[in-house]
C-alpha cells in the first residue's frame, strides 16, 4: 500500500487517514458559508471512476485566487501520482458539462463518502 | 438560526401566474442553493426547481415551460413565478435550503398554501 | 425520468424496529436523503448522504444504500414517530434535477 504524506502530520499517513481527512477537508469548506464558494466559478464536471483524484486536481486546479479550496487541492495533488498544472485535462472530464464548484465538492465528497464506508481507500 | 419564509396570495385564478416570495433570515442567501418544492394535500413532495446566486437554475423538466426562479441577495429573498396556473397546481409551497455539503434540505419554510380556483 | 419506489405504508409496535425501503435503479450510486413530516408540519431531514445524521436527530435513526434499494431503519420505535417518510435523491445528468419518493406513512400501533 502507498503512504501518503503532507498533510496534518510529518511522515506517512495511512491512505484511510489521508482520505477521511480529506472528506473533513470537504465538509468544512461547505460550512458556515458567507459567500458562494470560490465566488460562483464553474469546473468541468468529472466521471468519479478510477483516477478521479487526478480528474478532480485537473478540474479544481484551474480555479484561482480561491484561497477556500486551496488545501484541498493539496490534498488531491497527494492522491494523484503524477504532478497536475492548469489547463491539463485527461479524458475522464465530462468536458461538455461546467458546474459550480459548490456542486463539484458535493459530487466529490459523497463520492469519497462512499469510497470511505466501502474500505476503498486507494 | 436559518428561517425561511413564503409569502404571497393564497388563491389564484386559473391562467394567471402566481408570484411567492421565500424570505430568508440568520444566514446569508449568497452562499447556498435554494429550492422550492410543493405538496398537494393528502400527497407527496415535488420539486419544483432551484437556483444559485449566480442565477443559474435547474428547473424539474414537466413544470420548466412555466417557472421562473430569482434571487435577490441585497434583500435576501428569492422568488417563484409559476404562470398558467390550474387546478392541479392547488397545493402547500415551500422553499428550502439545499445543504452546503449534499443535496440533501437541511432548513425549511413552513409553507403556504396556494389555491387555484375562479 | 428517475423514480424512487416506497411502500405506502409501514407498521410498527413501540420498541420494536421499523424498515422503510426506497427503492430506484442503481440507487446505491446516488446520495440518499431522509425526511420525516408530521401533518401540518414541514419535512425534516433525518438522514442525509445514505447515513450521515444531521445534528439532533436520535441515534435510533439509521440508514444504509446499496444496489437498487435504500433502507432507513429507526429503532426502539416511539409513538412520536409516527410520521410520513420520504426518501430524495439529486439525479446528476444532462438535465440536473430532484427526486422525491411518494412516501411512506409510519404508524405506531
Known amino acids: 500500500l502507498t503512504c501518503l504524506g503532507g498533510f496534518a502530520s510529518p511522515g506517512p499517513v495511512p491512505p484511510s487517514t489521508a482520505l477521511r481527512e480529506l472528506i473533513e477537508e470537504l465538509v468544512n469548506i461547505t460550512q458556515n458559508q458567507k459567500a458562494p464558494l470560490c465566488n460562483g466559478s464553474m469546473v468541468w464536471s468529472i466521471n468519479l471512476t478510477a483516477g478521479m483524484y487526478c480528474a478532480a486536481l485537473e478540474s479544481l486546479i484551474n480555479v484561482s485566487g480561491c484561497s477556500a479550496i486551496e488545501k484541498t487541492q493539496r490534498m488531491l495533488s497527494g492522491f494523484c501520482p503524477h504532478k497536475v498544472s492548469a489547463g491539463q485535462f485527461s479524458s475522464l472530464h465530462v468536458r461538455d458539462t461546467k458546474i459550480e464548484v459548490a456542486q463539484f465538492v458535493k459530487d466529490l465528497l459523497l463520492h469519497l463518502k462512499k469510497l470511505f464506508r466501502e474500505g476503498q481507500f486507494n | 438560526q436559518v428561517q425561511l419564509q413564503e409569502s404571497g396570495p393564497g388563491l389564484v385564478k386559473p391562467s394567471e401566474t402566481l408570484s411567492l416570495t421565500c424570505s430568508v433570515s440568520?444566514?446569508?442567501?449568497?452562499?447556498?442553493?435554494w429550492s422550492w418544492i410543493r405538496q398537494p394535500a393528502g400527497k407527496g413532495l415535488e420539486w419544483i426547481g432551484r437556483?444559485?446566486?449566480?442565477?443559474?437554475?435547474n428547473y424539474n423538466s414537466s413544470l420548466k415551460s412555466r417557472v421562473t426562479m430569482s434571487i435577490d441577495t441585497s434583500k435576501n429573498q428569492l422568488s417563484l413565478k409559476l404562470s398558467f396556473m390550474t387546478a392541479a397546481d392547488t397545493a402547500v409551497y415551500y422553499c428550502?435550503?439545499?445543504?452546503?455539503?449534499?443535496?440533501?434540505?437541511?432548513?425549511w419554510g413552513q409553507g403556504t398554501l396556494v389555491t387555484v380556483s375562479s | 425520468s428517475y423514480v424512487l419506489t416506497q411502500p405506502p405504508s409501514v407498521s410498527v409496535a413501540p420498541g420494536q424496529t421499523a424498515r422503510i425501503t426506497c427503492g430506484g435503479n442503481?440507487?446505491?450510486?446516488?446520495?440518499v436523503h431522509w425526511y420525516q413530516q408530521k401533518p401540518g408540519q414541514a419535512p425534516v431531514l433525518v438522514v442525509y448522504?445514505?447515513?450521515d445524521r444531521p445534528s439532533g436527530i436520535p441515534e435510533r435513526f439509521s440508514g444504509s444504500n446499496s444496489g437498487n434499494t435504500a433502507t432507513l431503519t429507526i429503532s426502539r420505535v416511539e409513538a412520536g414517530d409516527e410520521a410520513d417518510y420520504y426518501c430524495?435523491?439529486?439525479?446528476?445528468?444532462?438535465?440536473?434535477?430532484?427526486?422525491f419518493g411518494g412516501g411512506t406513512k409510519l404508524t405506531v400501533v
Open positions: 428550502a435550503r439545499e445543504s452546503g455539503s449534499s443535496y440533501s434540505y437541511d432548513y
Open positions: 440568520g444566514g446569508s442567501i449568497s452562499s447556498y442553493y
Open positions: 437556483i444559485y446566486m449566480t442565477g443559474r437554475t
Open positions: 442503481n440507487i446505491g450510486s446516488k446520495g
Open positions: 448522504d445514505d447515513s
Open positions: 430524495q435523491v439529486w439525479v446528476s445528468s444532462s438535465d440536473h434535477h430532484v427526486v
